[in-house]
């Protein structure tokens, strides 16, 4: 049974199938425009810029913090503004941040245990296999890029981020100085969390305390629990219990309708958030732009490498990932990284991939047909071990490193600093402080100096939004992948593999209109398990 | 083979400039930095700071700001220090170094060293 | 600026004597640990980095150990020509420090 469609002006519906299979019902200019395609009159123009509103309303909210935060900086900046207004002009920012961050821990734990349970052991198996490579793969590619520019382009070489004194190094103190085996044996315990509810808010790291055995100072390592939510190992333990629902078989359905119902109950809270991003967005951007000083200091010492850095995120989001994702689809990838401008903006202005997963949810959902089931099993596990903007990044800053010091890399510490950057970035959710700390981790390994990693973290700021949008990018594109994969399997298949868990929801609610893309259809098995129902979910805005 | 040559030993008065210098031979200069080192008798071995062969660019220690400069002339493969306005807590043995390549900060080969004497 | 201490400033052996020289950094320098030769005419020369890795043309009776602070050159054969001021540096962050050396006569 389905439900009405909602109708536009003219009366008119249209059924299209989406890309999960099922029947997207919304009219023909809408989905054209909804799509970022051509729209010709002025009716079309309105509905096209109705569609579109939010997509642009981020966009400009990007622009306008730049503006603002350069306007203000120019009266002054933070010494002018004083502390307590900096801190109320950043406000709002911070207002955003708090609102995605109150949402990660319902969203990442409900998606993946409904995710996990919707999928039978095998298709989990493959789904999850396949992202994993692709994760993988893009990151490794991600890694050999940015090698590859930093070893052209020389940022480190003919820098003068070095030209003061060995104090502009940095105090080698600030460097972090971890071993490398105890960073990845807190990665494995943080993938075992031994309390769940302090893994919400709590990850363990392992820090050092000199002490005095038989007259020598010995560096004994001691474990502690450190502010910051252990997401690695609540995304384990969320997809472990969802395989353990599902073995329940009816047992289990109840727990699994409540978790499939809190989260639906979440992505309407994110709806709700999704039109307040723009807003906050706005002052993140400008805040940090605020707060900086002498940014053209700091862009003339490290120009090159910022270039660097911006110039390999740009080429591996704009030309290499699109590139895997029509060689693997044959569709227009551009169309699809439209439909995800809103948390694109939203990883620029927050800098968190695990604040920006409730809106590239929606997004990819609502706007590029990805199937609930793959898009809430996928992005969370994205968020948590696909880094290819920090790989990319780590792997540029380690070349840059080299050339300011002056160390030659042969062939075997290129393909040192390439593994470890890619192994590192997929643990560095498991890491606190991750992205220095990783970085220090391929110094070491490749006997590098960690002195001017404070040069790196000066600029880190501006970086790190670049690394976040290209995280999530890839993350959004594997799903997006992933949805292709799935639908030419159940293509060739008469029975279809991947099955969802039904909601203790009416099959017909009433539709409720939205502007933020299609209805989402999910597909539920009948009762006798034979026949397919396809039932419309509103998007609450 | 690598070699290191430093010009010869230097008698300053107070407030004069002098002029150190470093040939190298036997690699290719631009590949490895340049550091120097001061030797004092009562202070033992101080790291003044090094030169960047490839770019030029100088990167002093904090006792080395200010009377000190740290130069190239590539074609030749040669590296200078200057100190100007000597003082007579100059007086020492100055060496260049070969920063080497692989292990964060050692020195693989060194100058022979200059004996600068600052004497009123 | 990380300390780098020579406990002993002069040591006398005998020829064919087995000699360890100690060195302790102020904090963990990660095994960044090099030692020089100073002969008695001014020359230096390196003869062991990254604690125990020997330079070319050093002779193998020289050998290096030591982790985390605490570090030592051991000659295992003394000779002669190993008469000399024997130096450490730390070789983990800048700027690199020097100890204050050991100076080995011959009894």
């Known amino acids: 049974m389905v439900a009405d469609p909602p109708r536009d002006s003219k009366g008119l519906a249209a059924a299209e199938p989406t890309a999960n299979g099922g029947l997207a019902l919304a009219s023909i200019e809408d989905q054209g425009a909804a799509a970022g395609g051509y729209c010709g009159s002025r009716d079309q123009v309105r509905r096209c810029l109705r569609a579109n509103l939010l997509v642009l309303l981020t966009v400009v909210a990007v622009v306008a913090g730049v503006a603002l935060g350069l306007g203000v900086s120019g009266a002054g900046g933070a010494l002018a503004l004083g502390p307590e207004r900096l801190s109320a002009f950043v406000f709002p920012g911070e207002l955003l941040l708090r609102l995605l961050r109150m949402i990660i821990l319902p969203l990442v734990v409900c998606s993946l245990i409904g995710g996990a349970a919707s999928l039978d052991p095998g298709a989990l198996g493959r789904l999850g296999a396949w992202a994993l490579l692709f994760f993988l793969v893009t990151t490794l590619l991600a890694s050999a890029l940015g090698v590859g520019l930093a070893l052209a382009l020389q940022p480190g070489a003919a820098s003068a981020a070095i030209n003061a004194s060995v104090g502009a190094a940095g105090s080698a103190e600030n460097a972090p100085s971890k071993e490398v085996l105890d960073s990845f044996l807190d990665l494995a315990r943080n993938i075992f969390p031994s309390n769940l509810v302090s893994a919400a808010f709590r990850s363990y790291s392992t820090t050092y305390e000199e002490r005095n055995i038989t007259g020598t100072r010995v560096k004994v390592p001691v474990g502690q629990e450190v502010e910051g939510m252990n997401i690695l190992g609540l995304v384990v333990f969320a997809i472990v219990f969802g395989v353990a629902l599902r073995k329940l078989g009816p047992e289990g359905e109840l727990l699994i309708r409540f978790f499939n119902s809190f989260n639906e109950a979440t992505m309407v809270l994110v709806s709700w958030i999704m039109w307040y991003a723009p807003v906050g967005i706005m002052f993140l951007v400008a805040g940090k732009i605020v707060e900086m000083e002498d940014v053209g200091l700091l862009f003339a010492r490290l120009g090159k490498y910022i270039l660097c850095c911006l110039l390999g995120h740009a080429i591996h989001g704009l030309l290499v990932l699109p590139l895997i994702y029509f060689l693997f689809t044959r569709k227009n990838p551009y169309r699809f990284l439209w439909g995800i401008v809103t948390p694109l903006a939203t990883a620029f202005g927050t800098s968190s991939s695990s604040a920006t997963l409730p809106l590239m949810m929606k997004c990819v959902e609502e706007k590029n047909g990805v199937a609930k089931h793959i898009s809430r099993f996928i992005l969370p596990i994205g968020a948590t071990v696909n880094m290819d903007g920090a790989a990319l990044f780590q792997c540029v800053a380690a070349v840059f490193i080299a050339q300011l010091s002056q160390q030659s890399l042969d062939f075997v510490k290129i393909i040192t600093i390439l593994v470890t950057a890619t192994a590192s970035s997929v643990g560095a959710a498991g890491i606190p402080a991750g992205g220095v700390l990783t970085l220090a981790i391929i110094l070491e390994a490749v006997n590098l100096p960690v002195d001017h990693i404070s040069l790196i973290l000066a600029v880190d700021w501006l970086v790190d939004r670049s690394c976040t949008v290209l995280n999530v990018e890839g993350d959004a594109l594997g799903a997006g992948l992933l949805q292709n994969y799935v639908d030419r399997t159940e293509s060739r298949s008469t029975e279809p593999e991947l099955i969802q868990v039904k909601s203790e929801l009416p099959l017909d609610p009433l539709p409720v209109p939205t502007e933020e893309g299609n209805p989402l259809l999910k597909h539920y098995r009948g009762p006798a398990g034979d026949a397919t129902v396809a039932s419309e979910k509103e998007s609450v805005m | 083979q690598i070699q290191l040559v430093q010009s010869g030993p230097e008698l300053k008065k107070p407030g004069e400039t002098v002029k150190i210098s470093c040939k190298a031979s036997?690699?290719?200069?631009?590949?490895?930095?340049m550091s120097w080192v001061k030797q004092t008798p009562g202070k033992g071995l101080k790291w003044m700071g090094w030169i960047h062969t490839y770019s030029g660019v100088p990167i002093y220690g904090d006792d080395s700001k200010g009377r000190f400069a740290f130069s190239l002339e590539t074609s030749g493969s040669i590296a200078y220090l200057q100190i100007n306005n000597v003082k007579n807590e100059d007086t020492a043995t100055y060496f260049c170094a070969r920063r080497s390549d692989g292990y964060r900060y050692f020195f693989d080969y060194w100058g022979q060293g200059t004996t600068l004497t600052v004497s009123s | 600026d990380i300390q780098m201490t020579q406990i002993t400033s002069s040591l006398s052996a005998s020829l064919g004597d087995r000699v360890t020289i100690s060195c302790r950094a102020s904090q963990d320098i990660r095994n960044y640990l090099n030692w020089y030769q100073q002969k008695p005419d001014g020359t230096v020369k390196l003869l062991i980095y990254y604690t125990s890795r020997l330079h070319s043309g050093v002779p193998s009776r020289f050998s290096g150990s030591g982790s985390g602070t605490d570090y030592s050159l051991t000659i295992s054969n003394l000779e002669q020509e190993d008469i000399a001021t024997y130096f450490c540096q730390q070789g983990n962050t800048l700027p690199p420090t020097f100890g204050g050396g050991t100076k080995l006569e011959i009894k």
């Open positions: 036997g690699y290719t200069f631009t590949t490895y930095g």
